[in-house]
Interface confidence: low
């Protein structure tokens, strides 16, 4: 399918001239950012962005690649080098430390410099690094964390926690020896390390004592509380603030976000990670877009501004399963959240960044015809005289041999949401990839986001833009009309 107008050079020349005109009008703002939002697409490498763009277009009955994602409209772009101190290919813990704290760490550690060692509790103390969110709070801003994973998961934990093991969600996950040495689980750190105004995502079970039934799945013992210390962390958190509210379903969230008496809001909508968007029960669980909107409604009441972390955390999970359908539909919801946030904020006073912590070994190729389904087959056959999909993985659980050969695939099979794209190497879980990821920026000081940078640069841009430590002498003009 080739649109007739695209055969005419005028179409491309006119389009490029418009883009050039818009580029010439770009003026770096000399003002400080009152608000900071970082949108983190976990595992959202450039191939994921491209494939999601095509899917978003095709869902609107367009051909695909000519569509704009919300993040595509951000005027400034850089590349981020994602390696951790000890690994070429990182995990979400070490990367969270980089883009949220501005310092690189080791694989599977969070909020700690590389002097700390994975799983060695006694290397924690003295190696803590402080997140931009923490610094924003100290500067009087309201702060929030929104994710589709557990709120204690590696990426959000980078905003508030310091741990040598990203898997220490509750005290039941921490070895007794480490507990005796004083290492705290991530859920405990969530409520005790700093005052977070808005906490939205999954992770109920890590907050309640063992034996506490889950409100949504009361008959499923595996979904109930996991804590061994007998603590009800939600209750402890509520006791800290007069205007604190805890919610566990969508209806309560929407009510709380509009209630002026609510100053602090914790919403935990699943025992563990939230459901994939395609499985979500919208009567009970909010979407990432709805959680983002609720967070912005609360945080934007603060005249000093806010810091908000928003994570599309299950893009990564879809890829680990080699189920591109899940990863890409999660990416689209993530992009919808970015779009909604843009409608609710102003680029005059809000620096918005969109990035990924790392990529995945996810590829898009094979010369498919324009307009053909992103989940479809490449034209022609492979050397083994069988079809192959345009989306593939370098490794992962999609590797299958039937009678010693690669199975054939049909268009109807590859279009199924549960289809696992094939891979070259068999693994239980597909792996992250080590190539650079994109950073998109809009708002005050967004022009600093350029070139190829270390991932740590992201945290420093945010801190400088809002004149936070260590850039309190940033020499940026406050935006006209800003109140203190």
């Amino acid at each position: 399918i080739i649109p007739v107008e695209e055969e005419n050079p005028d179409f491309w020349n006119r389009q490029a001239a418009e883009a050039l005109g818009a580029a010439k009008k770009l003026q770096p703002a000399q003002t400080a950012a009152k608000n900071l939002i970082i949108f983190l697409g976990d595992g959202m490498g450039v191939s994921t962005v491209t494939a999601a763009r095509i899917l978003k277009g095709q869902k609107k009955d367009k051909l695909g690649p000519e569509t704009f994602l919300a993040m595509d409209r951000f005027p400034y772009v850089a590349l981020s080098k994602t390696y951790s101190v000890d690994k070429h290919v990182p995990d979400s813990g070490a990367t969270a430390t980089a883009y949220l704290c501005g310092v690189k760490g080791n694989f599977q550690t969070i909020g700690l410099s590389a002097a700390a060692r994975f799983n060695q509790c006694n290397t924690t103390r003295g190696n803590e690094v402080i997140s931009v969110m923490n610094r924003a709070k100290k500067a009087g801003k309201s702060v929030g964390v929104v994710t589709t994973t557990r709120v204690q998961h590696a990426s959000p934990a980078g905003a508030y926690a310091h741990t040598v093991n990203r898997n220490w969600y509750s005290d039941a996950d921490v070895p007794a020896s480490a507990r005796q040495e004083g290492c705290q689980d991530i859920a405990t750190q969530l409520i005790s390390n700093m005052d977070i105004d808005v906490i939205l995502g999954g992770g109920r079970k890590y907050m309640f004592p063992m034996g506490t039934p889950d409100p949504e799945y009361p008959d499923d013992y595996s979904q109930g509380g996991t804590r061994l210390d007998g603590k009800n962390l939600v209750q402890e958190w509520l006791a800290k603030h007069q205007g604190a509210r805890y919610v566990w379903n969508r209806t309560e969230l929407l009510q709380a976000s509009l209630d002026p008496s609510v100053t602090h809001l914790m919403g935990l909508f699943e025992p563990g990670d939230m459901k994939y968007e395609i499985h979500r029960d919208s009567t009970l669980d909010p979407s990432l877009m709805e959680m983002t909107e609720a967070a912005l409604l609360l945080l934007s009441r603060n005249p000093r501004g806010f810091f908000l972390f928003v994570e599309g955390g299950r893009i990564d999970h879809g890829h680990h399963e080699s189920r591109a359908y899940r990863a890409l539909t999660e990416t689209i919801m993530f992009d919808d959240a970015i779009e909604r946030a843009g409608q609710l904020t102003s680029e005059e006073d809000t620096l918005s960044l969109v990035t990924a912590d790392h990529s995945h070994v996810f590829s898009f190729g094979g010369y498919p015809l324009r307009g053909s389904s992103i989940f479809g087959l490449a034209p022609g056959k492979a050397r083994d005289r069988k079809a192959y999909t345009v989306l593939l993985y370098g490794n992962g659980p999609g590797y299958v041999l039937k009678d010693g050969a690669r199975p054939d695939v049909t268009e109807s099979e590859s279009g199924s949401p549960e289809y696992r794209q094939q891979s070259a190497v068999p693994l239980d879980g597909e792996t992250h990839a080590g190539e650079d990821v994109a950073v998109f920026a809009r708002g005050p000081q967004a022009h600093l986001v350029h070139g190829v940078q270390e991932q740590t640069f992201i945290a420093h841009v945010m801190a400088f833009a809002a004149c936070l430590e260590p850039y309190t002498a940033c020499d940026l003009a406050p935006r006209a009309g800003t109140t203190d």
Epitope: I278, H279, R280, S282, T283, D336, E418
Partner: nanobody, 122 residues
Amino acid sequence: QVQLVESGGGLVQAGGSLRLSCAASGRAFGDYNIGWFRQAPGKEREFVARRTWDGSSTRYDDSVKGRFTVSIDNAKNTAYLQMNSLKTEDTAVYYCAAGRYSRVRGWEYDYWGQGTQVTVSS
């Protein structure tokens, strides 16, 4: 487009069982929610049960909880409603529907079957 065809209805005595089938054609269930609804004579259509295609979320109306089970066979592109311990008040035309998520209206059912009559006699 999805076409849905129900079957399996009929006359059964109270306390008996029936299994309704809902075959989809035109497109796989994919990311659809499968809902079962019923409409008794002179009453509004009411929700009975629903299930996501992968079974990660299932909901039942209180009136059928513990008696009815909804399942999906993705390979056959067919959804089922197993109805046990049937009561006279279960008499109705039963419809299956395929629903997708709309960010404006939440889950809504875009495609409906023609319905199958279930009559429970005492």
